[in-house]
Amino acid sequence: RWRQQWSGSGTTSRFPETVLARCVKYTEVHPEMRHVDCQSVWDAFKGAFISKYPCNITEEDYQPLVKLGTQTVPCNKTLLWSRIKDLAHQFTQVQRDMFTLEDMLLGYLADDLTWCGEFNTFEINYQSCPDWRKDCSNNPVSVFWKTVSRRFAETACGVVHVMLNGSRSKIFDKNSTFGSVEVHNLQPEKVQALEAWVIHGGREDSRDLCQDPTIKELESIISKRNIRFFCKNIYRPDKFLQCVKNPEDSSCLSGISASHHHHHH
């Protein structure tokens, strides 16, 4: 049978097994989600993209799944990230009371996975899936992350933190999920401030990256939305993590502040 050839890699091998196993594990680790029926979650996930043309997926397609995965993060505990996922996850694994999207059920299920189906067949396409740039933006994976990222930002409250990669040419990138979705969906009536943590890459890098033009652009966008903005440099990410693990260490002074400058804007 003829199958459309897309430019992106195909569905992750053993996708259904992985999603179901992750769901079961998540509900075991998080007792507050014990009520979740993982078979229903998988059925809703599958229903969002199976038998549908993979360049015509909508946020509406994912609503049944979003409904099943409803979760709230306590105020001041949301951690967004852009182009620095691994460090963000290492941080929340230590700082257990803060949460990235991938620490929530739906983000956890889909992290690092690719998936797509085909129009009018019940098959999962393991050969190829649409690439965001080369094929289309309304593909199953991109629409999923846009949907859950929007919801994650909308439900955030208090002081929201974001980890940004100081090694990138655009520390804040308007085209990233953070820049194009999350920033615009923070609710000013619930979010008092956004605090950016700019992570330095080089050992000897002592520049104040909070003065970077793209950070100024982020500050402008946030301020216009009536949300206060703060920025901190984290010069030594390894030291930063170490101090989160062992805050009483004498070299850490007052918690995380030892490893970065603090800028109020």
Partner: antibody, heavy 117, light 107 residues
Framework: QVQLVESGGGVVQPGRSLRLSCAAS????????MHWVRQAPGKGLEWVAV????????YYADSVKGRFTISGDNSKNTLYLQMNSLRAEDTAVYYC??????????WGQGTLVTVSS | AIQMTQSPSSLSASVGDRVTITCRAS??????LGWYQQKPGKAPKLLIY???SLQSGVPSRFSGSGSGTDFTLTISGLQPEDSATYYC?????????FGQGTKVEIK
């Protein structure tokens, strides 16, 4: 306390069948993912199959897919592995294991399956 | 499938020594990794889950660390009863895959 006891192993000729059982006690059998893991003589551990708590989802390693069937009887608190078309390379100690939080937290003592003519 | 590579494949150490075993994943697996101990003729036993959480009843000399692709099992003061083969296991992407094992012998 949690206990898993396998049975049903033995010597069998290539191409023949065998059914392994794993009797579970000390926990609610229907609330956990149950797995079979095997270990060939002198070799490492290899995952074989899983059945999720409600029995509606069963998954297999490529090496046994189409030949082995995992099943469970919640009323008997027993896990099964039906092994058909056995091959010499299926010779191993077969363990049943309970999965909790992504880890095999309890294992049976194992049952040896020898496929030989 | 994700490949898990353990090193060393075997080691010999004295009672009281600090022993370190590493496990490297062929791709990032977050902290979805466990460590198991297996003695000859016995079933494996869970020591560490979620990369660093000590399983109930396991002596505190065992500890796990790491995230992403590189993980470590440390035995802080080796005891005679720690003579065994140790395996890592990932469950990040199905199916679960084990490392090839590290045999620890007492000098």
């Amino acid at each position: 306390q949690v206990q898993l006891v396998e049975s049903g192993g033995g010597v069998v000729q290539p191409g023949r069948s065998l059914r392994l059982s794993c009797a579970a006690s000390g926990f609610t059998f229907s609330s956990y993912g149950m797995h079979w893991v095997r270990q060939a003589p002198g070799k490492g551990l290899e995952w074989v199959a899983v059945i999720w708590y409600d029995g509606s989802n069963k998954y297999y390693a490529d090496s046994v897919k189409g030949r082995f069937t995992i099943s469970g009887d919640n009323s008997k608190n027993t896990l099964y592995l039906q092994m058909n078309s056995l091959r010499a390379e299926d010779t191993a100690v077969y363990y049943c294991a309970r999965m909790f939080r992504g880890a095999f937290d309890y294992w049976g003592q194992g049952t040896l399956v020898t496929v030989s003519s | 499938a994700i490949q898990m590579t353990q090193s060393p494949s075997s080691l010999s150490a004295s009672v009281g020594d600090r022993v370190t075993i590493t496990c490297r994943a062929s791709q990032g697996i977050r902290n979805d990794l466990g460590w198991y101990q297996q003695k000859p003729g016995k079933a494996p036993k869970l020591l560490i889950y979620a990369a660093s959480s000590l399983q109930s009843g396991v002596p505190s000399r065992f500890s796990g660390s790491g995230s992403g692709t590189d993980f470590t099992l440390t035995i802080s003061g080796l005891q005679p009863e720690d003579s065994a083969t140790y395996y890592c296991l990932q469950d990040y992407i199905y199916y679960p895959t084990f490392g090839q094992g590290t045999k620890v012998e007492i000098k």
